[in-house]
């Protein structure tokens, strides 16, 4: 009821709490002398379900049978309507529609740690839509019983606040949960367990790792556990991995030797505990320990390549390049690279430590047989040296790979293909494919890239340090013993028409013809490999089509003669450049008038 109503009453039969689907009878009745003045039969009683009129009747009382009420609370309000006045509220009542509790399912209890308290969880089943009280009961040996009630509406957890002790680990305890509301009650099936069944150890703590003699092969993991722990699970993984290595150990007593860790690797370690081989549950995983394993001396050998450049009649420049060892080969922080250069006949040797670079350039005499050895060193030692005899890589013409081609292969990849050399192809021990950005000045500072290919391969996909719209000079070397042959080609992964034409910087007259000189197009405007230059000319003030001369592109060329101009005629000249994608816009225009006599 709303509370004591002065004007009348609303009663609900059989009860104001009903089972879903039940029917109720609602009666609204006026108290004496509370109706409309003058005529009691003018009393009009109206029954509202919340704000919706569901029934009315003239007189002192109204009966209404109501069905189909939804789960939850429905408010009924009775009002009185008299002639020439507003409706006035007489009284009201709520009807609560719900269901009896279902049997709680999957009751399970746990004690976290040997010093923890027993707590149980269960599944309530469907909502009752009514206040439902849960009572948890635990009975143990010697007729001991404990009981706890839950006042929360969505109760599915209770902590008894009692601690089971290991004095008699095999003693049986039985738990049961009972749900009660206004429409009924239901109890779970009993759950029977022992101390060993329900105690879940606390996760191990104070985890440490020690490496004897700073060696990864002599590693021990230490931790602390609760006193009764019998089993441990260890899991560990490199910090950048998602897969765990798992180890199960019995009676470890807080230590375990790990034998398969990789050097110079950050690992994550976690440990879990259990009290009994087949009873109870594993603890949560411990907090992670992160630790880096010690370095070991590098394994593997450096991939070394070189370039020779003629300086003068007696000297040559040698540039050595090498690739970083992989993390698994370096097995530590590489502190320096050791380069040894030796003249093989005279025995002279020089050694140098290189830090912070993976290249080294020196000048040596053109005479003699030279060899280099390069190794990588970390705090524990050095890798095996890679030895290379310095030779003329392109000297053996018969070893030159044939029909070299370079084609774009998707985004930022170039597929290089070739045919084996004419000389016995079985003599080839390996191919090396080398590429570097094409710079018209032949800049030796441009980074060099290379990859090695087996002797039976006739193609290689190059993708490292390949940028769109850049032209690369690509060489394929065939190596056989102390001989080498090479072929070269230009290639790009993506191209479009150059952004500008060459800039004519001079036109000079020579014996009745002219020599045109130009500046190279800046590399960033070439937009790929140039194939041709075109020189255009036409008579000034003429509307005729210009004549043109097409010159194959050569890296170093920046002048060209034209001998088809008429003397004493003023011409306008300009140039364009072409890639496979098309022709650039005009470069600058220059006027020129040939002074010489006509041929």
């Amino acid at each position: 009821k709303i509370d004591a109503c002065k004007r009348g009453d609303v009663t609900v039969k059989p009860s104001h709490v009903i089972l879903l689907g039940s029917t109720v009878n609602i009666t609204c009745s006026l108290k004496p002398r509370q109706g409309c003045f003058h005529y009691s039969r003018r009393n009009k009683l109206i029954l509202y379900k919340f704000d919706r009129r569901i029934n009315f009747h003239h007189g002192h009382s109204l009966n209404s049978q109501v069905t189909g009420l939804p789960l939850g609370t429905t408010l009924f309000v009775c009002k009185l309507a008299c002639i020439n006045s507003d409706e006035i509220q007489i009284c009201g009542a709520e009807i609560f529609v719900g269901v009896a509790p279902e049997q709680p399912q999957n009751l399970s209890c746990i004690q976290k740690g040997e010093q923890g308290t027993v707590a149980c969880t269960w599944e309530r089943g469907r909502d009752t839509h009514l206040y439902t009280e849960y009572t948890l009961q635990l009975s143990g040996p010697k007729n001991l019983t404990w009981q706890k009630q839950c006042k929360d509406i969505y109760c599915d957890y209770l902590d008894f606040g009692i601690n089971l002790t290991p004095e008699s680990p095999e003693s049986n305890f039985t738990a049961k949960v009972t749900a009660v509301n206004s429409l009924g009650s239901s109890s779970s099936l009993p759950s029977t367990f022992t101390f060993l069944d329900i105690v879940r150890p606390l996760p191990p703590w104070d985890i440490r790792i020690k490496f004897q003699k700073a060696s990864v092969s002599r590693c021990t993991l230490y931790w602390r556990d609760e006193g009764l722990v019998l089993l441990n699970r260890l899991r560990y993984r490199p910090s950048n991995s998602r897969l765990w290595n798992m180890v199960n150990v019995t009676k470890a007593k807080g230590r375990h030797d790990l034998l398969d860790l990789k050097p110079f690797t950050e690992y994550e370690f976690q440990i879990s505990s259990k009290l009994h081989l087949y009873k109870g549950s594993w603890s949560d995983w411990s907090e992670s320990l992160r630790a880096q394993t010690p370095e070991e001396e590098p394994t593997g050998m450096l991939d070394v390549w070189y370039m020779k450049r003629h300086i003068d009649y007696s000297r040559q420049q040698i540039s050595l390049f090498w690739k970083n060892l992989s993390v698994s080969e370096a097995r530590g922080k590489i502190l320096h690279y050791q380069v040894t250069l030796q003249e093989l006949t005279g025995g002279k040797a020089m050694t140098q430590n290189i830090t912070g670079h993976t290249s080294w350039t020196t000048v040596i005499p053109r005479t003699g047989n030279w060899a280099v050895a390069v190794s990588a060193a970390n705090s524990k030692g050095s890798s095996l040296p890679t030895r290379i005899n310095i030779m003329n890589l392109c000297e053996a013409g018969l070893l030159a790979p044939r029909q070299v081609s370079a084609n774009s292969e998707g985004m930022d990849n170039i597929l290089v293909t070739w045919q084996p050399p004419r000389k016995d192809p079985s003599a080839v021990q390996e191919y090396v494919v080398e590429w570097r950005e094409l710079h018209p000045g032949g800049d030796t500072q441009v980074p060099l890239n290379w990859l090695r290919s087996r002797p039976y391969n006739v193609s290689a996909l190059i993708s490292e340090n390949i940028k769109s719209y850049i032209c690369y000079e690509i060489r394929v070397y065939a190596l056989s013993g102390d001989q080498g042959g090479c072929s070269s080609i230009l290639g790009n992964s993506k191209h479009k028409a150059p952004l500008s034409g060459p800039h004519i910087n001079a036109i000079t007259e020579e014996k009745g013809s002219i020599l045109i000189s130009w500046n190279s197009i800046p590399v960033q405007e070439q937009m790929g490999c140039l194939l041709h230059y075109r020189i255009y000319w036409k008579e000034r003030d003429s509307n005729s089509q210009p004549q043109l001369c097409e010159i194959p592109y050569r890296v170093s060329q920046n002048s060209h003669p034209i001998n088809s101009l008429q003397p004493r005629v003023t011409y306008v000249l300009w140039m364009t450049a072409l890639t496979a994608a098309g022709e650039s816009s005009h470069g600058n225009e220059r006027e020129f008038c040939l002074q010489g006599k006509a041929n």
């Epitope: 104001h16 939850g72 609370t73 408010l75 709520e94 609560f96 839509h129 509406i153 206004s182």
Partner: nanobody, 115 residues
Framework: QVQLQESGGGLVQPGGSLRLSCTAS????????MDWYRQAPGNEREWVAS???????YYDGSAKGRFTISRDNAKMTVYLQMNSLEPEDTAVYFC?????????WGQGTQVTVSS
Amino acid sequence: QVQLQESGGGLVQPGGSLRLSCTASGSIVSIYNMDWYRQAPGNEREWVASITSSGDPYYDGSAKGRFTISRDNAKMTVYLQMNSLEPEDTAVYFCKVPTEKGNYWGQGTQVTVSS
């Protein structure tokens, strides 16, 4: 045990607005309706608006179109936004939570509409 505390009442001019709040202690309120009632001097307490546990609002005829009831189950609070107030709305406004074990009422907050 559920306790209810109303707030937000005051003096307002005709045509003005007020927002009443009622905060409950005890999480059981989330499965029940929350209601607003009012009692004018010399009159009986009358129902104004209800909101179900799932958020469906209902209004008495005098409140329909001017008042809006809402609830925030996380904060265990029900609100009544009252617009276009008239002198006839002057009353003490009470918050109520009906349960099958009995009704819980707040102490009320005074709303006075006067120029």
